[in-house]
């Protein structure tokens, strides 16, 4: 939240943004870096073995607002964070898995930080 009198002007960002990519790298990417006119993202999700897999990459400007909104999907634990403030800003993103539903436990929920 901005304090009174503090400028709300957005920080100018690079027209073309470079992002770290992993498992979402286009074929022409070099050194796990992709380029976009949109956003960098980092996502954590359960894979098909229950592993908390982290992937990252570039999102084009078109539709990225929706993709970065992180709408909950039933029966899928997934969280995404996006950034635009500087090149490779997604290196510092730290999305966390949404908590398990209580019905997954028979002896009450386990507390997660």
């Amino acid at each position: 939240k901005k304090e009174d009198g503090e400028s709300t002007a957005p920080t100018p960002r690079p027209k073309i943004l470079r992002c770290k990519c992993h498992h979402h790298c286009p074929e022409d990417s070099v050194n796990n870096i992709c380029s976009t006119d949109g956003y960098c993202f980092t996502m954590i999700e359960e894979d098909d073995s229950g592993m908390p897999v982290v992937t990252s990459g570039c999102l084009g400007l078109e539709g990225s607002d929706f993709q970065c909104r992180d709408t909950p999907i039933p029966h899928q634990r997934r969280s995404i964070e996006c950034c635009t403030e500087r090149n490779e800003c997604n290196k510092d993103l730290h999305p966390t898995l949404p908590p398990l539903k209580n019905r997954d436990f028979v002896d009450g929920p386990i507390h997660h930080k």
Epitope: H23, N32, D48, G50
Partner: antibody, heavy 116, light 107 residues
Framework: QVQLQQPGAELVKPGASVKLSCKAS????????MHWVKQRPGRGLEWIGR????????KYNEKFKSKATLTVDKPSSTACMQLSSLTSEDSAVYYC?????????WGTGTTVTVSS | DIVMTQSQKFMSTSVGDRVSVTCKAS??????VFWYQQKPGQSPKALIY???YRYSGVPDRFTGSGSGTDFTLTISNVQSEDLADYFC?????????FGDGTKLELR
């Protein structure tokens, strides 16, 4: 809380098979994946494979495909691993581990000794 | 298969010290790495997932860092109960593979 109970030890003869069990409690058995890991003294840890208790779907380490068979018994919330054609190389501690994203609980381990 | 190398088999430390256990992957695994602690006669206990996320209940003196091929588990203010074996594991691709472990001993 989430717990995985395994028998302490199994003594088996070379060439025989053994079925190891892993009884889960404290959570809904079908909502976590069950992994199996082998540990030999001085040889580190090896991932054998995993099973989805809900669908019964499995994924194996190629190295253990002809050695291990993973199954589940949903009514008793028990995962099992059958090891076949046992040799001294199979003497080890075998762990089951229940995984779900940011939860990772290991069983107590079963020591398998292959000896005539 | 991806090879996880823990080059230091043993590390000596004193209570109160800060110690860093390292692990190197043979190819890029992003941040898809677990760290485990194992005490003699016990099963492994998960400390860290996704290279830097602490499991619930793990003391905050345990910190994971790194990405790509180089990973570090740092224990600040080492306690006597931290003397154990520490293993890294990659889960970026199958088969899942472990490092050979680093034994933390009292100097």
């Amino acid at each position: 809380q989430v717990q995985l109970q395994q028998p302490g030890a199994e003594l088996v003869k070379p060439g025989a098979s053994v079925k190891l069990s892993c009884k889960a409690s404290g959570y809904t058995f079908t909502t976590y994946w069950m992994h199996w890991v082998k540990q030999r003294p001085g040889r580190g840890l090896e991932w054998i494979g995993r099973i989805d208790p809900n669908s019964g779907g499995t994924k194996y380490n190629e190295k253990f495909k002809s050695k291990a068979t993973l199954t589940v018994d949903k009514p008793s919330s028990t995962a099992c691993m059958q090891l076949s054609s046992l040799t001294s190389e199979d003497s080890a501690v075998y762990y089951c581990a229940s995984r779900r994203g940011d939860i990772d609980v290991w069983g107590t381990g079963t020591t398998v000794t292959v000896s005539s | 298969d991806i090879v996880m190398t823990q080059s230091q088999k043993f590390m000596s430390t004193s209570v109160g010290d800060r110690v860093s256990v390292t692990c190197k992957a043979s190819q890029n695994v992003g941040t898809n790495v677990f760290w485990y602690q194992q005490k003699p006669g016990q099963s492994p206990k998960a400390l860290i997932y996704a290279a830097s996320y602490r499991y619930s209940g793990v003391p905050d003196r345990f910190t994971g860092s790194g990405s790509g091929t180089d990973f570090t588990l740092t224990i600040s203010n080492v306690q006597s109960e931290d003397l154990a074996d520490y293993f890294c594991q990659q889960y970026d691709s199958y088969p899942l593979t472990f490092g050979d472990g680093t034994k933390l001993e009292l100097r």
